[in-house]
């Protein structure tokens, strides 16, 4: 019982540091990160550093996770135009060689 209580405490503490709408990999099963809700605030590409697509069948919905310049992660809806435009912009930024 003590072990379960300690584990529960650890999980609660860990949950505090997880970005909104984002579920971290499950150590017991295959490592999958899923988004459960999306931001509805439009964020400028000026604040976005990178992104990754979430397409796993283990997740309830397809998503895009943006990483910001301050290393925060945001779940976004890939169907929204601003999200698509941001991904395009970041793709171009990556392709452009630094001079």
């Amino acid at each position: 019982m003590k072990v379960s209580a300690a584990l529960l405490c650890l999980l609660l503490i860990a949950a505090t540091f997880i970005p909104q709408g984002l579920a971290q990999p499950d150590a017991i099963n295959a490592p999958v990160t899923c988004c459960y809700n999306f931001t509805n605030r439009k964020i400028s590409v000026q604040r976005l550093a990178s992104y990754r697509r979430i397409t796993s069948s283990k997740c309830p919905k397809e998503a895009v996770i943006f990483k910001t310049i301050v290393a925060k992660e945001i779940c976004a809806d890939p169907k929204q135009k601003w999200v698509q435009d941001s991904m395009d912009h970041l793709d171009k930024q990556t392709q452009t060689p630094k001079t």
Partner: antibody, heavy 119, light 113 residues
Framework: QVQLVQSGAEVKKPGASVKVSCKVS????????MHWVRQAPGKGLEWMGG????????MYAQKFQGRVTMTEDTSTDTAYMELSSLRSEDTAVYYC????????????WGQGTLVTVSS | DIVMTQSPDSLAVSLDERATINCKSS????????????LVWYQQKPGQPPKLLLY???IRESGVPDRFSGSGSGTDFTLTISSLQAEDVAVYYC?????????FGQGTKVEIK
């Protein structure tokens, strides 16, 4: 184009609270990250707090923590800033401010609301 | 918190002359991967809210005259008005847009000599 219209000037007694409103048009409030900035007479700009989409929550400047509450009524696209335990140093023009795509700065500003705290 | 310090507090410049305002941040606002400085400049005229002039330290907001320019990197930045016009009389503020809490400089008042 975002437009922000604020409520009118207020005169309050020390210890009282004030609630300033900011009505959004041109966008829905849930698309924006609304912030509040104040300016005491003849002084500079001071960020009080606002919705940070990178954290998914409202952030407050440490100076105002516990005394300020920022809320949103999404049905009317109106943002509110309530400041309690008012003192004379809180006499200032209070601005709501945002950007259509959140960028860490403010492209659109309300006209300002003068709050005077006087006994 | 990042502290923003402007200098001078005020300056008087003749019409058509150059005005230079400095802004120093207590820590770097340069994001190395994209080489962008997260520093913005505003202009505020009496009785009006601030107006965005420049972002990323040097990019003019649309509609801002090209006599306004910004330079600098890391912790030291400059706003230059190449040829001061009567309508440029205002208070100018820098703001770092990298980390919360967002912080402003104390402002620089520009007047005509």
């Amino acid at each position: 184009q975002v437009q922000l219209v604020q409520s009118g000037a207020e005169v309050k007694k020390p210890g009282a609270s004030v609630k300033v409103s900011c009505k959004v048009s041109g966008y829905t409030l849930t698309e924006l990250s609304m912030h509040w900035v104040r300016q005491a007479p003849g002084k500079g700009l001071e960020w009080m707090g606002g919705f940070d989409p990178e954290d998914g929550e409202t952030m407050y400047a440490q100076k105002f923590q516990g005394r300020v509450t920022m809320t949103e009524d999404t049905s009317t696209d109106t943002a509110y800033m309530e400041l309690s335990s008012l003192r004379s140093e809180d006499t200032a023009v209070y601005y709501c401010a945002t950007d259509d795509f959140w960028s860490g700065y403010f492209d659109y500003w309300g006209q300002g609301t003068l709050v005077t705290v006087s006994s | 918190d990042i502290v923003m310090t402007q200098s001078p507090d005020s300056l008087a410049v003749s019409l058509d002359e150059r005005a230079t305002i400095n802004c120093k941040s207590s820590q770097s606002v340069l994001y190395s991967p994209n080489q962008k400085n997260y520093l913005v400049w505003y202009q505020q005229k009496p009785g009006q809210p601030p107006k965005l002039l420049l972002y990323w330290a040097s990019i003019r907001e649309s509609g801002v005259p090209d006599r306004f320019s910004g330079s600098g990197s890391g912790t030291d930045f400059t706003l230059t008005i190449s040829s001061l016009q009567a309508e440029d009389v205002a208070v100018y503020y820098c703001q770092q847009s990298y980390f919360t809490p967002w912080t402003f400089g104390q402002g620089t008042k520009v007047e005509i000599k």
